[in-house]
Amino acid sequence: SAPGEDEECGRVRDFVAKLANNTHQHVFDDLRGSVSLSWVGDSTGVILVLTTFHVPLVIMTFGQSKLYRSEDYGKNFKDITDLINNTFIRTEFGMAIGPENSGKVVLTAEVSGGSRGGRIFRSSDFAKNFVQTDLPFHPLTQMMYSPQNSDYLLALSTENGLWVSKNFGGKWEEIHKAVCLAKWGSDNTIFFTTYANGSCKADLGALELWRTSDLGKSFKTIGVKIYSFGLGGRFLFASVMADKDTTRRIHVSTDQGDTWSMAQLPSVGQEQFYSILAANDDMVFMHVDEPGDTGFGTIFTSDDRGIVYSKSLDRHLYTTTGGETDFTNVTSLRGVYITSVLSEDNSIQTMITFDQGGRWTHLRKPENSECDATAKNKNECSLHIHASYSISQKLNVPMAPLSEPNAVGIVIAHGSVGDAISVMVPDVYISDDGGYSWTKMLEGPHYYTILDSGGIIVAIEHSSRPINVIKFSTDEGQCWQTYTFTRDPIYFTGLASEPGARSMNISIWGFTESFLTSQWVSYTIDFKDILERNCEEKDYTAWLAHSTDPEDYEDGCILGYKEQFLRLRKSSVCQNGRDYVVTKQPSICLCSLEDFLCDFGYYRPENDSKCVEQPELKGHDLEFCLYGREEHLTTNGYRKIPGDKCQGGVNPVREVKDLKKKCTSNFLSPEKQNSKSN
């Protein structure tokens, strides 16, 4: 069973009084409706809360919004609805919050049917003041900020126009018509697809991919016969229709579309899809859907060019049309990802990789748990994690797995222990070493969040009944204390804490219901007095990530280096604080064949770490193309895994081969790459 609240746990002294003095209630004078919450900036304490209520009238629905602002992490809220002239805000657009600490907010208003364009409310002072601006178009999407300059906005209109503003939405200019999809790239570049013959849907597979680097003054067509495109890390991907049939395949560019290479990935048919699961500046995880309505596909991992791909995981669960996948980046430990596979018997199993997709294994059975009814052998089974797919299937799973970069090694997730994911009520499990080992943390489903970089974990039981109790742990989930935050239980709707897990405040959202009224209410609890003192050097202990066998000289080596961290001791009850920076010490490892992937034209036979040349590429529907022309590709068969930092050791040297493959995609032909100016 999970560790409880027994005396052995060593309670935090006088915590009830400390928390009671730091519990702040706010009742919202609204009919219930819906509520959305956004944090404005980092470490500013500013929260915006938008409540909306639809009043169904005979002919139409009348909408009413209220906007509230807090500047103390949710302890107090002020009704600022008058700043937006009591206008109804369209919740489907959400609150568009500017990047970094720009303090910018855009709210999109509902306007009456006959109006010429939409209306937005803009703030650039963390929502202290708003300016109303009438738009020359009706927006189809939320305003998108340029990551480099928060004054630059783009939006698509309901007429498929691409509109750009250079002064934070004050003035708008339509820079292109017939646009299907637009995205900001780096350096204020905009990529977008256009249609020629009527509509985005009709032209799917015949779209053009355009780029503007000067906010619409000039354009370059960087691709034709486009089905869709995506950005990931430093890579630009486009799926392109083949000449001969209805299949399409991925092309990749690392220079903003000036030159393209055909990715060494299988082509897909009409009913299939590609999906970028994760990408960084080193590499990309790509899912390629299987033919037919299977609900699974294959994960491939790329080389540093995004061109050569290694098969990483078969039967990867990803429901048709790219609906749900459990693929999760464990952000608390480098190289760790968790996902689900659909096994032959249609059961779903969780897999984990610790080396960025090189090898996948089942999750180790938690020490304090027994195998459930799904297990054939009651002594041998694994932990299976509930993520997006379970949530979509309406299983009793209130939250997806949680990890935070500054709470090193901590992963919290709902799971079941057996041979596969179970439909039984799950429990909550925690790992303190990035997924290598797991412990049952809480019995039954819970909402959970990490505060103070892992110094506190907070949880609330998932229940259909009203609740008034919150649980917290100061030792990474080993022991729990319970605190009754209100006498009158509330119907709980969500936990909110500032993104980044550095805060010590948690807000509990819900509503109260009495005979006649129903009101939104929030309780914000500040844990600062639980963690009374600042952590000192003595409160931290050394930990080697990815350690599995200390007798192995290279213990802890992942992608060519090992990392030691200073981590908060489990028994230390102190504040990491807002400015906490993870202390880590990397050390380079010697290279082994594991640090290399096989280059184009080579493969690894099963259970062998050597790359051998493919006799010929028959049976492989893979064409290689570099920069759109016949190319000499010299290779020794090995290529360092992206992000691998190993030095010395094994250096795979063998005769350098000249590989010549013709490029057959007219997508890349230079005459298609014409420039145009407005």
Partner: antibody
Framework: QVQLVQSGAEVKKPGSSVKVSCKAS????????ISWVRQAPGQGLEWMGG????????NYAQKFQGRVTITADESTSTAYMELSSLRSEDTAVYYC?????????????????WGQGTTVTVSS | DIQMTQSPSTLSASVGDRVTITCRAS??????LAWYQQKPGKAPKLLIY???SLESGVPSRFSGSGSGTEFTLTISSLQPDDFATYYC????????FGGGTKVEIK
């Protein structure tokens, strides 16, 4: 089989320093923390501090802070403990011990291999 | 620093007896506790780590239990070789040892 072999007995004058060595053989020295523990005649065990050879991360018990320096030389698989400003109360047997490791934590699993001990006598 | 209080400080027992030594931590240390045996003139020997895990090569008559602040070392049937001094040691926080329990022949 891992062994920790310590340097020989020392007799020191009050106010001077002593440096005790601890050489590991037969195991991966770099992957374990080495702790130093002392035992005064007829007394219990007292932890002085420890070091992780990779990177040389050292930490010390509050009582010895500023007076003890623990170092490690990966190339020779040797750890050192230097205690300065010696006084008669520092007369004790000084042990080095390897911290057992089951996960990435260096200090959580007890000390599974011990040196034979080095007697340090402080006397004027 | 975390204080470890061991009791009793001396224990008289006979061969075959069941012997229990307790150790109390001044604050919760979860399961991060080790037990050692030391004989005169010798270095300590690890018996138990993580409160209840038996170190390899240690006879199964030794067992450990507890978590949080209260811990116990039990010798189910005392053998002639077991007369020695026993120490507990907390491993979470700067390491501290208990004062020791001397098990002597009754």
């Amino acid at each position: 089989q891992v062994q920790l072999v310590q340097s020989g007995a020392e007799v020191k004058k009050p106010g001077s320093s002593v440096k005790v060595s601890c050489k590991a053989s037969g195991g991966t020295f770099r992957n374990y923390a080495i702790s130093w523990v002392r035992q005064a005649p007829g007394q219990g065990l007292e932890w002085m501090g420890g070091i992780i050879p990779i990177g040389g991360w050292a930490n010390y018990a509050q009582k010895f802070q500023g007076r003890v320096t623990i170092t490690a030389d990966e190339s020779t698989s040797t750890a050192y403990m230097e205690l300065s400003s010696l006084r008669s109360e520092d007369t004790a047997v000084y042990y080095c011990a390897r911290q057992g490791r089951k996960t990435g934590y260096y200090y959580y699993y007890g000390m599974d291999v011990w040196g034979q001990g080095t007697t340090v006598t402080v006397s004027s | 620093d975390i204080q470890m209080t061991q009791s009793p400080s001396t224990l008289s027992a006979s061969v075959g007896d069941r012997v229990t030594i307790t150790c109390r931590a001044s604050q919760s240390i979860s399961s991060w506790l080790a037990w050692y045996q030391q004989k005169p003139g010798k270095a300590p020997k690890l018996l138990i780590y993580k409160a209840s895990s038996l170190e390899s090569g240690v006879p199964s008559r030794f067992s450990g239990s507890g978590s949080g602040t209260e811990f116990t070392l039990t010798i189910s049937s005392l053998q002639p070789d077991d007369f020695a001094t026993y120490y507990c040691q907390q491993a979470d926080g700067h390491i501290t040892f208990g004062g020791g329990t001397k098990v002597e022949i009754k």
